[in-house]
Structures are given as structure tokens and as C-alpha cells.
Interface confidence: low
Amino acid sequence: EEDGFCQPYRGIACARFIGNRTVYMESLHMQGEIENQITAAFTMIGTSSHLSDKCSQFAIPSLCHYAFPYCDETSSVPKPRDLCRDECEILENVLCQTEYIFARSNPMILMRLKLPNCEDLPQPESPEAANCIRIGIPMAD
């Protein structure tokens, strides 16, 4: 039986956002598998003409932190930190609205790209959201 655990990020695709910080993984094999999948997703994004600069500036780090969430150092058991719901919603509904609509209607993109469901994230004022991962989207401040 394998529990989730925390390990240093060893990948390349998200290194500029995560560095070698500790991320939460759900099995020994998971980090390598996710690295392969997110690399393929980023390759696809790079060739897309549908991604605006204002969206990609925050969508790329957001996807990295969703794929490789920081470990919650305040928890006594290995636990991932969530993305912040307010930023997630601004990304989906404002900065990347067109891109999300396109992505969700395109099966090929959905196969490669795992988009966060903002409704699954803790409410901003809840205790669970106190330690959420903030990307730094200006409109959320």
C-alpha cells in the first residue's frame, strides 16, 4: 500500500516555478508520469495560436502548481496545498475565458491538459484555503 508523500521536484517542465521545492505525490511513480504528461501538454500549448499572453502568463504556473502541488508543511500528514480559488476563478472567467472555452470543447486538448475545476477548491474564507498556493494574479489581490 502506498500513501501520498512529499518529495523534492526533480523535473524540468515546471522548474522555473517550483525549483526543487517539496511537492506532494501520490505514488513513487507519479512524478515522472506527470512530468511526461505536462511536457506533452506544454509542447501542444507552445504550438497553439489560441493562447494569449495575458492568459499564458498565469495559466502556465497555475497548471504547474496544480500538477505538482507544494506540500503543506503545516500538516502532520503528507498533504498537498490547493490552488487559491479566487485566482482560479479569475483565470477561468477573465484572463483565460476564451482559452478555457476552446480547451473544454476540444477533446484532443482535454486529453493532454488537466484543467483545475475551481468549484472543487476550498472557499476563500475557509480554514482549508488559508495556506493555498497563490500565483500572484493582480486582480485577485
Partner: nanobody, 111 residues
Framework: EVQLVESGGGLVQPGGSLRLSCAAS????????VGWYRQAPGKQRELVAR???????YYADSVKGRFTISIDNSKNTLYLQMNSLRAEDTAVYYC?????WGQGTLVTVSS
Amino acid sequence: EVQLVESGGGLVQPGGSLRLSCAASHYISRFYAVGWYRQAPGKQRELVARISSGGWTYYADSVKGRFTISIDNSKNTLYLQMNSLRAEDTAVYYCNARNLWGQGTLVTVSS
């Protein structure tokens, strides 16, 4: 406490398909490592497939390209679609969420 209940097992011919389901009594939070394990007679329990909160997947080499794991959060249900089944896939299949286990469902592949 969350309870896991598997279904969908049975007898199938080699090359056939089955879909296993694992219904959870509550929402399975992203803190769980959700997946399928199997145990063949006289063998150790082994990881078959796993899915993380973002839909990132892991498959054992022996099932890659044949099995597909998926999760429906709205139904609190985990699935394992098994195609091109082989005799060596015969086992009891268990749903797993961190330290929680279902009771298992028997899959028998035989002609």
C-alpha cells in the same frame, strides 16, 4: 468514514472487456491516492492503475494500453475500463483510497 464498494467483476473470455466501478460513500478528497490494485491467487497485491486529483494517471506496465482508469467526482465513483483481457488478468480487484480498501471484486478471464 468513507466506505468503498466495488462492482463489475465477473467471468469473461480472453480478449473481452469489463468495467469495474468503485462507489465511495462520501466525496473522496484530493488527499487520497485513488487507484485499483489486484491480487491473483498465491501472489502479492499489486498496483494496477492510479489517478490523482488533476486526472494524472499511472498504469502498471502489464496493463498499459489495455486498461483505463477514470473518476467521476459528481458520482463519487472510480472506474477501471479493462479491454483485451488476458488469463493473467484473473484476480480480485480492489479499490484503494490511501489507507481505505474496498471488499474486492473477482475478475476471471477464461475460455
